[in-house]
């Protein structure tokens, strides 16, 4: 069975997997992939380390946290009702059928924020003004300073040069009524 | 043998600031993560924050964001926790340990923190 | 952040007894959950990761299970060195979090 995870449209999805490397630096190979994990390896895959590096990985797909200290979570940038479905972590431990499977279903919600026909408001009191990094482990979020009054035209291309910019990648959990 | 040892405790003045120590031994630090854990007396366990050695990257709980201040000095093997603005609801066990990668497998010692004037 | 409500917050019981304690996440953690235990006056020590992986050295009579959000601590015939607080702690999102402790008493 798997595990539900949630994520709203045009947030980072963060799907959390983590091994104990048997000694440091002793890596083992990890598969992340679109679908149920098979049998064997990982099908559709998104990411795949080795024993040294990440040595596979697709647009917007990236581990989070540092896979050299077991920490293999699943980073999905901008996420779209497109990513819903479920994501296999497979952790390749050598041996017959050793490895440890981990399917994790992501469930994707339409964003929060609705535009509304009257005055429009500032851009901090619409959102909750938190921004991600693209550091290591679960997001971690920064606070702005204040903004001046924006409208949503310029609320979309901000939001796009932060993203394009990589300092940010969502603006989440607004629940905000943009006025 | 895998130990993490903490520096001694410390009686400091409201107000000002202190830096604890663990350094650790039987392992490198730059592999694990190290974190930093409180305990009130006769309270539970909070968590402050961690570092990645290797990179110098912190997380901290919200709670301890600008209180506390997480190092580490990968030449020495020790990490540091830096806390300010001291009042007595800082006095407390603090406990460094490792990680690997998100469950505790070794703890130091602790290091009692009084605050008092 | 996600809540770890630990129950009871304290319990007695005999030598020889099988005990449980609950560790109930506000969130889904799927098994990115530890035990501890922390005897009067000493520090932590692991007991179990991954929500019911022993580890290295913990005695048979400790097991875990659960996931998600639902998780056990069961120790059985009770001995009197399991005299102790006992804390789940979640690892799957900053910040970590413990929770309260159970504290475990012999009659």
């Known amino acids: 069975s798997e595990v539900e995870y949630r994520a709203e449209v045009g947030q980072n999805a963060y799907l959390p997997c983590f091994y104990t490397p048997a000694a440091p630096g002793n890596l083992v190979p990890v598969c992340w992939g679109k679908g149920a994990c098979p049998v064997f390896e990982c099908g559709n895959v998104v990411l795949r380390t080795d024993e040294r590096d990440v040595n596979y990985w697709t647009s917007r797909y990236w581990l989070n946290g540092d896979f050299r200290k077991g920490d293999v979570s699943l980073t999905i940038e901008n996420v779209t009702l497109a990513d819903s479905g479920i994501y296999c972590c497979r952790i390749q431990i050598p041996g017959i059928m050793n490895d440890e499977k981990f399917n994790l279903k992501l469930v994707i919600k339409p964003a929060k924020v609705t535009p509304a026909p009257t005055r429009q408001r500032d851009f901090t009191a619409a959102f909750p003004r938190m921004l991600t990094t693209r550091g290591h482990g679960p997001a971690e979020t920064q606070t702005l300073g204040s903004l001046p009054d924006i409208n949503l035209t310029q609320i979309s291309t901000l939001a796009n040069e932060l993203r394009d910019s990589r300092l940010a990648n969502d603006l989440r959990d607004s629940g905000a009524t943009i006025r | 043998e895998v130990q993490l040892q903490q520096s001694g405790a410390e009686l400091v003045k409201p107000g000002a600031s202190v830096k604890l120590s663990c350094t650790a031994s039987?392992?490198?630090?730059?592999?694990?993560?190290i974190h930093w854990v409180k305990q009130r007396t006769d309270q539970g366990l909070e968590w402050i924050g961690r570092?990645?050695?290797?990179?110098?990257?912190?997380k901290y709980a919200p709670k301890f964001q600008g209180k506390a201040t997480i190092t580490a000095d990968t030449s020495s093997n020790t990490a540091y926790l830096q806390l300010g603005s001291l009042t007595s609801e800082d006095t407390a066990v603090y406990y460094c340990?490792?990680?690997?990668?998100?469950?505790?497998?070794?703890w130091g010692q602790g290091t009692t923190l009084t605050v008092s004037s | 952040d996600i809540q770890m409500n630990q129950s009871p917050s304290s319990l007695s019981a005999s030598l020889g007894d099988t005990i449980t304690i609950t560790c109930h996440a506000s969130?889904?953690?799927?098994?990115?959950l530890s035990w501890y235990q922390q005897k009067p006056g000493n520090i932590p020590k692991l007991l179990i990761y991954?929500?019911?992986n022993l580890h290295t050295g913990v005695p048979s009579r400790f097991s875990g299970s659960g996931s998600v959000t639902g998780f056990t601590l069961t120790i059985s015939s009770l001995q009197p060195e399991d005299i102790a607080t006992y804390y789940c702690?979640?690892?799957?999102?900053?910040?970590?979090?413990f929770g309260g402790g159970t504290k475990l008493e012999i009659i």
């Open positions: 340990a490792r990680s690997s990668p998100y469950y505790f497998d070794y």
């Open positions: 039987g392992f490198n630090i730059k592999d694990y993560y």
């Open positions: 969130q889904n953690i799927n098994v990115w």
């Open positions: 570092i990645d050695p290797d990179n110098g990257e912190t």
């Open positions: 991954k929500a019911s």
């Open positions: 702690q979640q690892g799957q999102n900053f910040p970590y979090t």
